[in-house]
C-alpha cells in the first residue's frame, strides 16, 4: 500500500494521512458514543495482524444500517485492495469470537495508534 | 496538578556522555495515551526536539540525532532519561522534559513542561 | 523535515490593540478534520507554555484573547487586545509527524 484516493481531497492521499483519518473517526466515534455503538451489533473478532483492514471490513461490513460506522467502512475500503461484500470472510482466518462492534472499534483503535506511534504506515 | 522536573551534571567534557533525569507527578506513564518528551534550547535560540517514550515503550528520536539518543522510562519512580552520547559544544543548552498532551495518542504536543536544566560542554 | 517559518520575527503592539503572528509549514500538516499545529508562549528564564492546540484549540487556562486559525500550510496566532504580560517569544509546532520541529519564534 504506497497511496490511496483521498475522502476529501482531490489527488491521492499519503498513507500516513489516510490512517491518521482513519484515526481520528475512530477516537470521533469512541468519544461520541452514547447509546450502544449500532444497538450492541456483534462482529466476528480478527488478528490484528496481515490483511487487517480488509479482515476489520469484512468484519464491520456486516453491520447494516448503523451510520455510526459508515464512514469507517468507507474508509476502511480505501486501505483493502479487494471489492469486500457483506458475507464475504476470506481476510477474516479465524471466525470464533464475537464482540460487540464498540469492542472492536476500541481495539482496533489501540493498534492503529500503535502503529501510527511506531511510524509503521503501510 | 501536574509537574516536571529536569536534572543533569551541568557541566561536562566534550566526547562524554549526558545522562539527564525527568522526575514528574500528577501523571503516570502507565496510563494509555500518555508520553514524555526531550527539547533543547540553545541560549538565545530556537527550541529542538529531541526523543519521546510512550506509556507502551514505544520511543520516537530525532533522525538528525537518533545515533547519539537513547530514551528509557522507569514507570513505577515516575522518571524518564535521556543520554546523548560524545556531547560537543553544539549541545550546549537548556534540557527540557515535557508531557505529551495528545487527544489522539499519537501526535507529540507538549502540554506541560519542567522548567529545564542547563548544560555546557566545554574543554 | 517540515520547516516552520514564522513572520514577524520580531512585532511591537500598543496595548489594547491586536498582535498577528504567522507560520507557515512547507507541507501541510492537516486532514480534512484537523490541524496538527500548535502553539507555545516563553518569556525569558521560562518554559515555553502551551497556548493553542490543533490550530485553534485553547489550551485550559488559557486567556481567551489568544485564538489560532488556520490550515495546511498556512497558520495565525492572534493576540487581542494585547496586555503588557503578553510580552514573550512565541514558538509554532507541528506534530505531524517525526521529526517535530519549530518556527523559529515571533
Known amino acids: 500500500l504506497t497511496c490511496l484516493g483521498g475522502f476529501a481531497s482531490p489527488g491521492p492521499v499519503p498513507p500516513s494521512t489516510a490512517l491518521r483519518e482513519l484515526i481520528e473517526e475512530l477516537v470521533n466515534i469512541t468519544q461520541n458514543q452514547k447509546a450502544p455503538l449500532c444497538n450492541g451489533s456483534m462482529v466476528w473478532s480478527i488478528n490484528l495482524t496481515a490483511g487487517m483492514y480488509c479482515a476489520a471490513l469484512e468484519s464491520l461490513i456486516n453491520v447494516s444500517g448503523c451510520s455510526a460506522i459508515e464512514k469507517t467502512q468507507r474508509m476502511l475500503s480505501g486501505f483493502c485492495p479487494h471489492k469486500v461484500s457483506a458475507g464475504q470472510f476470506s481476510s477474516l482466518h479465524v471466525r470464533d469470537t464475537k464482540i460487540e462492534v464498540a469492542q472492536f472499534v476500541k481495539d482496533l483503535l489501540l493498534h492503529l495508534k500503535k502503529l501510527f506511534r511506531e511510524g509503521q504506515f503501510n | 496538578q501536574v509537574t516536571l522536573k529536569e536534572s543533569g551534571p551541568g557541566i561536562l567534557q566534550p566526547s562524554q556522555t549526558l545522562s539527564l533525569t525527568c522526575s514528574f507527578s500528577?501523571?503516570?506513564?502507565?496510563?494509555?495515551?500518555?508520553?514524555v518528551g526531550w527539547i533543547r534550547q540553545p541560549s538565545g535560540k530556537g527550541l529542538e526536539w529531541l526523543a519521546h517514550i510512550w506509556w507502551d515503550d514505544v520511543k520516537r528520536y530525532n533522525p538528525a540525532l537518533k545515533s547519539r539518543l537513547t530514551i528509557s522510562k522507569d514507570t513505577s519512580s515516575s522518571q524518564v532519561f535521556l543520554k546523548i552520547a560524545s556531547v560537543d559544544t553544539a549541545d550546549t543548552a537548556t534540557y527540557y522534559c515535557?508531557?505529551?498532551?495528545?487527544?489522539?495518542?499519537?501526535?507529540?504536543?507538549?502540554?506541560?513542561w519542567g522548567q529545564g536544566t542547563t548544560l555546557t560542554v566545554s574543554s | 523535515d517540515i520547516v516552520l517559518t514564522q513572520s514577524p520575527a520580531s512585532l511591537a503592539v500598543s496595548l489594547g490593540q491586536r498582535a498577528t503572528i504567522s507560520c507557515r509549514a512547507s507541507?501541510?500538516?492537516?486532514?480534512?478534520?484537523?490541524?496538527?499545529m500548535n502553539w507555545y508562549q516563553q518569556t525569558p528564564g521560562q518554559p515555553p507554555k502551551l497556548l493553542i492546540k490543533?490550530?485553534?484549540n485553547l489550551e485550559s487556562g488559557i486567556p481567551a484573547r489568544f485564538s489560532g486559525s488556520g490550515s495546511g500550510t498556512d497558520f495565525t496566532l492572534n493576540i487581542h487586545p494585547v496586555e503588557e504580560e503578553d510580552t514573550a517569544t512565541y514558538y509554532c509546532?507541528?506534530?505531524?509527524?517525526?521529526?517535530?520541529?519549530f518556527g523559529g519564534g515571533t
Open positions: 507541507q501541510s500538516v492537516s486532514t480534512s478534520s484537523y490541524s496538527y
Open positions: 515535557a508531557r505529551i498532551g495528545t487527544n489522539y495518542g499519537y501526535d507529540g504536543l507538549f502540554d506541560y
Open positions: 509546532q507541528h506534530s505531524w509527524e517525526i521529526p517535530y520541529t
Open positions: 490543533y490550530a485553534s
Open positions: 500528577g501523571f503516570s506513564l502507565s496510563t494509555s495515551d500518555m508520553g
